[in-house]
Interface confidence: low
Amino acid sequence: HSDPARRGELSVCDSISEWVTAADKKTAVDMSGGTVTVLEKVPVSKGQLKQYFYETKCNPMGYTKEGCRGIDKRHWNSQCRTTQSYVRALTMDSKKRIGWRFIRIDTSCVCTLTIKRGR
Amino acid sequence: HSDPARRGELSVCDSISEWVTAADKKTAVDMSGGTVTVLEKVPVSKGQLKQYFYETKCNPMGYTKEGCRGIDKRHWNSQCRTTQSYVRALTMDSKKRIGWRFIRIDTSCVCTLTIKRGR
């Protein structure tokens, strides 16, 4: 997705994005909360297509690992947190049943706040 | 994805999530920047599977439409901005070629900052 830094902007939370293959991923959590195996390849009309995903998560080495950038620290505690979304993937469940399911993958790094008590 | 409010937390930016069908979406932008048509259904053995996507974007009606929550306003200007990620979808390009392509979809609402100049 477009890079805020290019527009002279900073993100409140630093993130890293990467392409993750099913081979790297191995398992995921589906919408029912069950753990499923992510199949490496998807059969298509002309053979097989490697299954992979674009994932974004909070940068554990970034400046914002201790808290979010630009927050009013007098009033708020902050934390950068990886959030997830759902994408469809070809998977196999614990009963070895194969099918397309929506699985959770990391898609963003957002800032969450809690009010500072008793100042 | 898990709801920060459940943990007594607030998001720096308010977002809304929804399931979007290909019929609603109609077109999308692929990784090369080209506009493609998103096919409504994917052929499967017993008919067709509806193609749909889980999308998250900034809430235009939310409190944070004027700027991010919890920001140190003495030093920063802020804006909540919808970010995108890539998911695979069955699409048709301008030359009517059908295939699986990665398309951009809205997946998050994050806060971007710019430093306040000349105080």
């Epitope: 998807v42 059969p43 196999m92 049943r97 194969i98 397309w100 | -």
Partner: antibody, heavy 122, light 109 residues
Framework: EVQLLESGGGLVQSGGSLRLSCAAS????????MTWVRQAPGKGLEWVST???????YYADSVMGRFTISRDNSKNTLYLQMNGLRAEDTAVYYC????????????????WGQGTTVTVSS | KIVLTQSPGTLSLSPGERATLSCRAS???????LAWYQQKPGQAPRLLIY???RRATGIPARFSGSGSGTDFTLTISSLEPEDFAVYYC??????????FGGGTKVEIK
Amino acid sequence: EVQLLESGGGLVQSGGSLRLSCAASGFIFDDYAMTWVRQAPGKGLEWVSTINQNSGTYYADSVMGRFTISRDNSKNTLYLQMNGLRAEDTAVYYCATTGTTYDYPHYPMDFWGQGTTVTVSS
Amino acid sequence: KIVLTQSPGTLSLSPGERATLSCRASQSIGSRYLAWYQQKPGQAPRLLIYDASRRATGIPARFSGSGSGTDFTLTISSLEPEDFAVYYCQQYYDWPPLTFGGGTKVEIK
């Protein structure tokens, strides 16, 4: 056109073995889960075993440990190796397609073969 | 294991009449994970309805399926001579095992 042709049935003594085959054509065999269903004389349908596209296998309790389902994708053929046969295994055995990887993993049996008869004498 | 109970065991009707066959599950199988098959003597079963209400390819419109949860129905709006057969329901919600009902025989009155 989808075609499934079972073979290998016959008369066998109790405790004996048989290997059933199901030759498939008219569809991409590799993409499909396949199932064996049997029907005892004058009785209803009973699920026996299923093998999925990744060769994950499932068995009815009544045949677990005695029957083995397998597939040879290069030959488009499904097998059922039946050992330790009992009189109650006497039935017509059908093979059937059970859905492709493009489906959610809950699927009925779309296409059936005509069946092969297994008779176990005691 | 989900048990499917079909009723009635036998249905005696005349051509042109409406046939209503019932299939009850011992526990909920969702809104769609039920199939109906037709079997004629000496023949293999044939898929009629899947996902509770969707007609399989080539199945005439007089066959329809309905229901969800534990109660499902196969309706033949106007019986044709070739419809006299045994009908089985099957659940594919919670498997293994895949389970079938005991069957309903539709015979000529």
